[in-house]
Amino acid sequence: QLPPGKPEIFKCRSPNKETFTCWWRPGTDGGLPTNYSLTYHREGETLMHECPDYITGGPNSCHFGKQYTSMWRTYVMMVNATNQMGSSFSDELYVDVTYIVQPDPPLELTVEVKQPEDRKPYLWMKWSPPTLIDLKTGWFTLLYEIRLKPEKAAEWETHFAGQQTEFKILSLHPGQKYLVQVRCKPDHGYWSAWSPATFIQIPSDFIMNDHHHHHH
């Protein structure tokens, strides 16, 4: 029977800069029941606080609700593992909420084939930012990426859309059914999951174009 091994805080994420959750990985348990606690202080403070919510994020997690989350203060946190034989501590981790944002996927992806009389046809798509993200404050710049492929193809074709919420693609295979998805990333954070796939049937008379894609 031994003291517990060193735990590791291996992930922190925020959906919107207003709340966040951190998760830790236990070290070896030393063959005894082990208690874990996450303690933190904020920059400029010496007072240590204990995790406000061990439940919301699931096992081995600490959730910081709105009243505990500040974008302006760095959090310095560590996990303590204790059993009857002793204790061990994780490395300290510095967390700036700006750098852990992983938004929900974009919403309302719509895809249409446009066939204007005077120009080549194209695939047009638009979407909305995730609901939890408030872009009006200027704290967020969301970047978008689109991927699409014929239904039976193995490889995805990926396009970076920058900050636009609509996009044109001019080069597609006529008669094919395509899957289209979009994801987003804040300028300093992590890519969201891909949105649910939207399917679009490309007409057989769709004229292939040499130009690949075009940003609005």
């Epitope: 700036d96 704290w139 992590y190």
Partner: antibody
Framework: QVQLQQPGAELVRPGTSVKLSCKAS????????MHWVKQRPGQGLEWIGV????????NYNQKFKGKATLTVDTSSSTAYMQLSSLTSEDSAVYYC???????????WGQGTLVTVSA | DVVMTQTPLSLPVSLGDQASISCRSS???????????LHWYLQKPGQSPKLLIY???NRFSGVPDRFSGSGSGTDFTLKISRVEAEDLGVYFC?????????FGGGTKLEIK
């Protein structure tokens, strides 16, 4: 404890390429972004770019686009930087550095001295 | 790119003295989120740099309280209240508010 291990030195010919390695240990490699920094002898530091090992997203200093290519091998917890078309201007110490969930460097490798010489 | 200008280039001090290093940025370093990402690193001879101060005035873990940082906007200062032998080396300021992140040219702290 967190360690970033880099080879001590590389001697390379002008016009060739070199691939520098940075082996991470003591933490979950895919959890934190890895940066690369250049230091010419007796001079200041230059940020080259950063890679997110979890999905290989990269962001480069415009000055090093086309010169440096950042990659990772998650199976060996190793970050790489390839430098191409080497000239004497590329002779420098190159550091890999890790932040936490922040935008400063908490951990640094020992650096690899690249010497470009015929 | 944001240019970081450090003064002086070299700072000869006697052990026990106070030392002060200035860092000026060519643009304001206040991020859109309200934070100022100005940091200080110390590089001792033959070693890689080590973080001393983050976000203007916060001492990194294990950094003695004789180190302090201050400033705002474009003007920042690192002070060492009583210089010890282990403090000798090159001090760099760094900004990570604007991409690309940039560093000052360094200030060499040496014994008078």
């Amino acid at each position: 404890q967190v360690q970033l291990q880099q080879p001590g030195a590389e001697l390379v010919r002008p016009g060739t390429s070199v691939k520098l390695s940075c082996k991470a240990s003591g933490y979950t490699f895919t959890s934190f972004w890895m940066h690369w920094v250049k230091q010419r002898p007796g001079q200041g530091l230059e940020w080259i770019g950063v890679i997110d090992p979890s999905d290989t997203y990269t962001n480069y200093n415009q000055k090093f686009k086309g010169k440096a290519t950042l990659t990772v091998d998650t199976s060996s917890s190793t970050a790489y930087m390839q430098l191409s078309s080497l000239t004497s201007e590329d002779s420098a110490v190159y550091y890999c550095a890790r932040g936490d969930y922040s935008n400063w460097f908490t951990y640094w490798g020992q650096g690899t001295l690249v010497t470009v010489s015929a | 790119d944001v240019v970081m200008t450090q003064t002086p280039l070299s700072l000869p001090v006697s052990l026990g003295d106070q030392a002060s290093i200035s860092c000026r940025s060519s643009q304001r370093l206040v991020h859109s989120n309200g934070n100022t990402y100005l940091h200080w690193y110390l590089q001792k001879p033959g070693q890689s740099p080590k973080l001393l101060i983050y976000k203007v005035s916060n001492r990194f873990s294990g950094v003695p309280d004789r180190f302090s940082g201050s400033g705002s906007g474009t003007d920042f200062t690192l002070k060492i209240s009583r210089v010890e032998a282990e403090d000798l080396g090159v001090y760099f300021c760094s900004q990570s508010t604007h991409v690309p992140w940039t560093f000052g040219g360094g200030t060499k702290l040496e014994i008078k």
